[in-house]
C-alpha cells in the first residue's frame, strides 16, 4: 500500500523565524526517516539535537523532533523529511520540506561576500544565478554592476528568488565582472560581491600518466590515459594520433573533473587491442581550446615474449655498516613484463622476516641495518603467466664498528684509585666486525697540576704507545690478547698488568677495525691515602695543649681542601671556616693540609671536618673527626704501692697506675733517689709499672712513685723486702 | 569610463599634515571601497588602509594607524587621506585604487616629498 | 601580518623565454592574490586576481597559479614590452600585504 507523505509540524511551503530562537520541528511518519538540512546546520553542531519517538496512535508512528537552538541567519534553507529505504519508484511522494528564513536584521544575506567576492563561473547563453539569497522574504535586494549599471528583474530574463538570488535564464556578455546585491536594513547599507567569469582558452598542464617509454607484449592490451588541467572556465578538445592511425585501431573515452575547486581536469584514454609489432612508435596526445595547443607524447615498444635477464650491480659479496640507516640491496634487472619480486635472506622470505626490510622495485632496502642483516640474500624473479622464472645471490657482511664492553657497562662517575705501590690488571674487552685489533697507550699526568683534572690534560701532551717492553709510566707486567664469548659473542679480551703502581696517568684502550676506532680512558690515579681521602688527629689535646690535625686526600681527585668547624644552632648544622689553616702541600700523589690550634681551650671542642670538592663529580665531601678537649685535672693513684716481700733471684712488679688531664708523667725513686731504666730494672708503658728481673738483696728498700701533671702530683711508697741469701754467697 | 583623479604633488615640512584627494570618475564610490597605497624606493609598495564610503567604515595597517586618516565626501565622489607629523620616510608616491579584483583602476599617483 | 616573500628579485631573459616568478605567504591565503606589472614611471597595472584569472585585456602569455601559500607568475613567451617591475598582493586578510617585487630586464 502506498505510503502518506511524512509531516512536517510546522505547515506550508516557508516559514520565518527571528535569529537567536529555537527552531523546533517535528516529523511525523509511517516509516523511519530522516531529516536533510542546510549545509551550514552541521549535524554535530551542539546547537542541533533530533529525538526519535514512537507516536501516534497505539505507537504505530514514528516521530523525529529536530531542536536548533540559537538558530541564526545562516541556518536560513531547506529542511525535510525523508522516508529511509523506500523503492524508487515510490520516491516523489515519501519526502516532505520547508523552507526556513532564519531573519537577522544585521545581516540579510545567507551568504555574505563584501570583501572578496565569490567568483561564479558563467557560459554566455546559459542560466546565470547570482546565489544572494536573503534571510527574510520581506527584503527587497538591488543587483548592480560595477561601474554604473543595475540589472532590473523582468520577471522572465532576469527573475528574483528570495530562496535563490538572482535567476538570469541567458548570460550575456554584459552580465560579465563585478555583480553586487545591495539591501538597506534599517538605514544600512548591505553588499555582498559576485565576480563573474567566461570561459578562457588557457590550459595549464598536459600528462601521459603511463611509465615512459611504454612497454607490451604483442597481443596485449594497450591503454594510455591523457590528462589535460585548465582553469575552472575552460573547456578542451583532446585528439590523439599514433602509428596505425590510418586503419582506426584505437577507441577513445573522454571524462572531465570538475570536482576540484581551482582547475577542471579532463580525460582522454586510448585503448588499442592485440597489440602488434605495427602499433609500435610514438602516441601523441594534442590537447586545443581556441587559440591555445598544448601536446605530450610517448613511445610504446612492442616485446615477442616475455624474459628476464638478472646481474650484480657491483660484485657478488656485499659490504654495509651497522648502524647506517638505510642499506638498498640492488639486482640489475632487465625484464618484460614486469615480474614479481621475492627477495630470501638466508633462504627464508625477507620481509616476513623483519619489517626492516623493504622491497623496492629490484631493491631490497634494509632499514637501521644491524649485524644480525648479515647473511645471502636471494632475489627470486619470476613471471608465472609465461612460466619465466630467475634467481641470483648475493652475500651481505655488515661490518660492526669496535664497542669496548667495560665501557657500556662502568656506572662510575669518578675515577678509581690505586694504592701506591700495588700490582693492577687493566681489561678492555672489544667486539667488532672484522675482529678488531686492540693497542694500549700511556698518558702521563702532569705533574704541576693541581686544579685541573688529569683527563682534562691539554693535547699536545702526547699518549705513548705501549707493550710489555715499555719503559712509559709505570713498570708494565705483560700485556696479553684472549678470546672471550660474552653474551653470546666472540670478544676480543686485552690485559694489561702494571707490576708496581707509581705513577698516575691515563691508561688508554683503543680498539680498531676497518670501520672505525673507539677507546677507552681508565684513569689511573695512584693514591697514599687509604680510599683518596684521610683526616688524622696526633692526639686528643688536653687544655692548654696544641690541637694538630692533618687533612690528606688523592690530589688527581679532590680540590679546594679546607677546614671547617661544624657547629649545631637552632637544630641547624652550620659550617664555619677556621682561618687558622695553613697552606697545603702538594706532593706527589696527595695534598695535605694541617690544622693547628695552639693552646686549646674547652671552647675549642667540636666537630672538625675537612672539606674537599670531587673534580669529577663536582660533589663536596667531609671528614669529620669529633675533638673533646679535655679540662685539666689534678693526678691521682688507682691504688697505692703496698710493702710486699719477694725471694731472691725472682722478678717483681711495682704498679703505679694514676688517671690525671693531662695523662700524669711517673716518675719513680727508691730510698730518694731517681729510678732510671737500667739493665734489669724495666719502666713499662708511661712509667707506670717498675719490673725488676732477678731480685738481688741490693733492691730491698722503699720505693716511691709520683705522678705529676700541670695541675699538681700524686704520691705512694711501700716497702720491698727480699728474702732468702744471694747465689753470690752460696757460692762464696 | 572609470577613472581615479589624484591631486597634485605636494612638497611639506617636516612636522606638518598634507590632505590627498583622489576623485573617481564613471563609477560612484557608493558602491565599492577605495584603497590607499604607498610606494617608495625603500619599503616598496605598502597597503596603507582603505574605506567604505556609504558607512565610512575603515580598515588600516597597523604601521599607518595614527599617520593615516582616510575619508570619503559621497557628494563629491572623492575619498580623501590625511597625513599627519611627516617626517622624510614619509616621502612616497601615494596611490587610490579600487580592490584588487576590481579590474585594473589605480590613479595616477601623488608624490608627496618631506623636506625642510 | 602576512608575510609574501617575492623570487627571485632580479631576472634576466630574453625574448620569446619563458620565466616564472614565485610568491610564498608565510600563512595561509587561500586564492587571494593578486599579482600586478609596474613599468617605470607608471602606476601598477593588474594582470592576474584569484591567483589565477586573468584580467581582460591581459595577453594569455601571463599565467598565474597557486593556491594556499604558494603562488607563480609564468610569463611563457616573453616580449620587450614585458619589461617592468612585477609584484604580488594578498588580500585574504587585513592588512593587505605586497611583495617585495621582482625586476624583469630583458637581454
Known amino acids: 500500500s502506498k505510503l502518506k507523505d511524512p509531516e512536517l509540524s510546522l505547515k506550508g511551503t516557508q516559514h520565518i523565524m527571528q535569529a537567536g530562537q529555537t527552531l523546533h520541528l517535528q516529523c511525523r511518519g509511517e516509516a523511519a526517516h530522516k531529516w536533510s538540512l542546510p549545509e551550514m546546520v552541521s549535524k554535530e553542531s551542539e546547537r542541533l539535537s533530533i529525538t526519535k519517538s514512537a507516536c501516534g496512535r497505539n505507537g504505530k508512528q514514528f516521530c523525529s523532533t529536530l531542536t536548533l537552538n540559537t538558530a541564526q541567519a545562516n541556518h536560513t534553507g531547506f529542511y525535510s523529511c525523508k522516508y529511509l529505504a523506500v523503492p524508487t519508484s515510490k520516491k516523489k511522494e515519501t519526502e516532505s520540506a520547508i523552507y526556513i528564513f532564519i531573519s537577522d536584521t544585521g545581516r540579510p544575506f545567507v551568504e555574505m561576500y563584501s570583501e572578496i567576492p565569490e567568483i561564479i563561473h558563467m557560459t554566455e547563453g546559459r542560466e546565470l544565478v547570482i546565489p544572494c539569497r536573503v534571510t527574510s522574504p520581506n527584503i527587497t535586494v538591488t543587483l548592480k554592476k560595477f561601474p554604473l549599471d543595475t540589472l532590473i528583474p523582468d520577471g522572465k530574463r532576469i527573475i528574483w528568488d528570495s530562496r535563490k538570488g538572482f535567476i538570469i535564464s541567458n548570460a550575456t556578455y554584459k552580465e560579465i565582472g563585478l555583480l553586487t546585491c545591495e539591501a538597506t536594513v534599517n538605514g544600512h547599507l548591505y553588499k555582498t560581491n559576485y565576480l563573474t567569469h567566461r570561459q578562457t582558452n588557457t590550459i595549464i598542464d598536459v600528462q601521459i600518466s603511463t611509465p615512459r617509454p611504454v612497454k607490451l607484449l604483442r597481443g596485449h592490451t594497450l591503454v594510455l590515459n591523457c590528462t589535460a588541467t585548465t582553469p575552472l572556465n575552460t573547456r578542451v578538445q583532446m585528439t590523439w594520433s599514433y602509428p596505425d592511425e590510418k586503419n582506426k585501431r584505437a577507441s577513445v573515452r573522454r571524462r572531465i573533473d570538475q570536482s576540484n575547486s581551482h582547475a577542471n581536469i579532463f580525460y582522454s584514454v586510448l585503448t588499442i587491442d592485440k597489440m602488434q609489432n605495427k602499433d609500435k612508435g610514438l602516441y601523441t596526445c594534442r590537447v586545443r581550446s581556441g587559440p591555445s595547443f598544448k601536446s605530450v607524447n610517448t613511445s610504446v615498444h612492442i616485446y615477442d615474449k616475455a624474459f628476464i635477464t638478472v646481474k650484480h650491480r657491483k660484485q657478488q659479496v656485499l659490504e654495509t655498516v651497522a648502524g647506517k640507516r638505510s642499506y638498498r640491496l640492488s639486482m640489475k634487472v632487465k625484464a618484460f613484463p614486469s615480474p614479481e619480486v621475492v627477495w630470501l635472506k638466508d633462504g627464508l622470505p625477507a620481509t616476513e622476516k623483519s619489517a626492516r626490510y623493504l622491497t623496492r622495485g629490484y631493491s631490497l632496502i634494509i632499514k637501521d641495518v644491524t649485524e644480525e642483516d648479515a647473511g645471502n640474500y636471494t632475489i627470486l624473479l619470476s613471471i608465472k603467466q609465461s612460466n619465466v622464472f630467475k634467481n641470483l645471490t648475493a652475500t651481505l657482511i655488515v661490518n660492526v664498528k669496535p664497542q669496548i664492553y667495560e665501557k657500556a657497562v662502568s656506572s662510575f662517575p669518578d675515577p678509581a684509585l690505586y694504592p701506591l705501590g700495588s700490582r693492577q690488571i687493566l681489561t678492555c674487552t672489544a667486539y667488532g666486525i672484522p675482529q678488531p685489533t686492540i693497542k694500549w697507550f700511556w698518558h702521563p699526568c702532569n705533574h704541576n697540576h693541581s686544579e685541573a683534572r688529569c683527563d682534562f690534560c691539554s693535547n699536545n701532551e702526547e699518549s705513548f704507545i705501549l707493550d710489555a717492553d715499555s719503559n712509559m709510566g709505570n713498570r708494565i707486567e705483560s700485556i696479553t690478547q684472549r678470546m672471550a664469548i660474552i653474551e653470546g659473542k666472540n670478544k676480543m679480551a686485552s690485559t694489561l698488568v702494571v707490576a708496581d703502581s707509581r705513577i698516575s696517568g691515563i691508561y688508554i684502550c683503543i680498539a680498531s677495525n676497518k670501520v672505525g676506532t673507539v677507546g677507552r680512558n681508565i684513569s689511573f690515579y695512584i693514591t697514599d691515602v687509604p680510599n683518596g681521602f684521610h683526616v688524622n688527629l696526633e692526639k686528643m689535646p688536653t687544655e692548654g695543649e696544641d690541637l694538630k690535625l692533618s687533612c690528606t686526600v688523592n690530589k688527581f681527585l679532590y680540590r679546594d681542601v679546607t677546614w671547617i668547624l661544624l657547629r649545631t644552632v637552632n637544630n641547624r648544622t652550620m659550617h664555619y671556616s677556621i682561618s687558622k689553616q695553613k697552606m697545603a702541600i702538594t706532593k706527589e700523589h696527595s695534598i695535605t693540609l694541617n690544622l693547628t690550634i695552639m693552646n686549646v681551650s674547652l671552647q675549642d671542642s667540636g666537630t672538625y671536618a675537612c672539606r674537599a670538592r670531587n673534580v669529577y663529580t663536582g660533589e663536596e665531601i667531609l671528614q669529620k673527626k669529633e675533638i673533646t678537649i679535655r679540662d685539666q685535672e689534678a693526678p691521682y693513684l688507682l691504688r697505692n704501692l703496698s710493702d710486699h716481700t719477694v725471694a731472691i733471684s725472682s722478678s717483681t712488679t711495682l704498679d703505679c697506675h694514676a688517671n690525671g688531664v693531662p695523662e700524669p708523667q711517673i716518675t719513680w725513686f727508691k730510698n730518694n733517689h731517681k729510678i732510671q731504666q737500667e739493665p734489669g730494672i724495666i719502666l713499662g708503658p708511661g712509667s707506670s709499672t717498675l719490673f725488676i728481673e732477678r731480685v738481688t738483696e741490693e733492691d730491698e728498700g722503699v720505693y716511691h712513685c709520683k705522678a705529676t701533671n700541670q695541675k699538681g702530683s700524686v704520691e705512694s711508697s711501700a716497702y720491698l723486702t727480699v728474702q732468702g741469701t744471694s747465689d753470690k754467697s752460696n757460692l762464696e | 569610463q572609470v577613472k581615479l583623479q589624484q591631486s597634485g604633488a605636494e612638497l611639506v615640512k617636516p612636522g606638518a599634515s598634507v590632505k590627498l584627494s583622489c576623485t573617481a570618475s564613471?563609477?560612484?564610490?557608493?558602491?565599492?571601497?577605495i584603497h590607499w597605497v604607498k610606494q617608495s624606493p625603500e619599503q616598496g609598495l605598502e597597503w596603507i588602509g582603505r574605506?567604505?564610503?556609504?558607512?565610512?567604515?575603515?580598515k588600516y595597517d597597523p604601521k599607518f594607524q595614527g599617520k593615516a586618516t582616510i575619508t570619503a565626501d559621497t557628494s563629491s565622489n572623492t575619498a580623501y587621506m590625511q597625513l599627519r607629523s611627516l617626517t622624510s620616510e614619509d616621502t612616497a608616491v601615494y596611490y587610490c585604487?579600487?580592490?584588487?579584483?576590481?579590474?585594473?583602476?589605480w590613479g595616477h599617483g601623488t608624490t608627496v616629498t618631506v623636506s625642510s | 601580518d602576512i608575510e609574501l616573500t617575492q623570487s627571485p628579485k632580479f631576472m634576466s631573459t630574453s625574448v620569446g623565454d619563458r620565466v616564472s616568478v614565485t610568491c610564498k605567504a608565510s600563512?595561509?591565503?587561500?586564492?587571494?592574490v593578486a599579482w600586478y606589472q609596474q613599468k617605470p614611471g607608471q602606476s601598477p597595472k593588474a594582470l592576474i586576481y584569484?591567483?589565477?584569472y586573468r584580467y581582460s585585456g591581459v595577453p594569455d602569455r601571463f599565467t598565474g597559479s597557486g593556491s594556499g601559500t604558494d603562488f607563480t607568475l609564468t610569463i611563457s613567451n616573453v616580449q620587450s614590452e614585458d619589461l617592468a617591475e612585477y609584484f604580488c598582493?594578498?588580500?585574504?586578510?587585513?592588512?593587505?600585504?605586497f611583495g617585495g617585487g621582482t625586476k624583469l630586464e630583458i637581454k
Open positions: 585604487a579600487l580592490p584588487p579584483f576590481y579590474f585594473d583602476y
Open positions: 564613471g563609477f560612484n564610490i557608493k558602491d565599492t571601497y
Open positions: 600563512q595561509n591565503v587561500d586564492t587571494n
Open positions: 574605506i567604505d564610503p556609504p558607512n565610512d567604515n575603515t
Open positions: 584569484s591567483a589565477s
Open positions: 598582493q594578498q588580500y585574504n586578510s587585513f592588512p593587505y600585504t
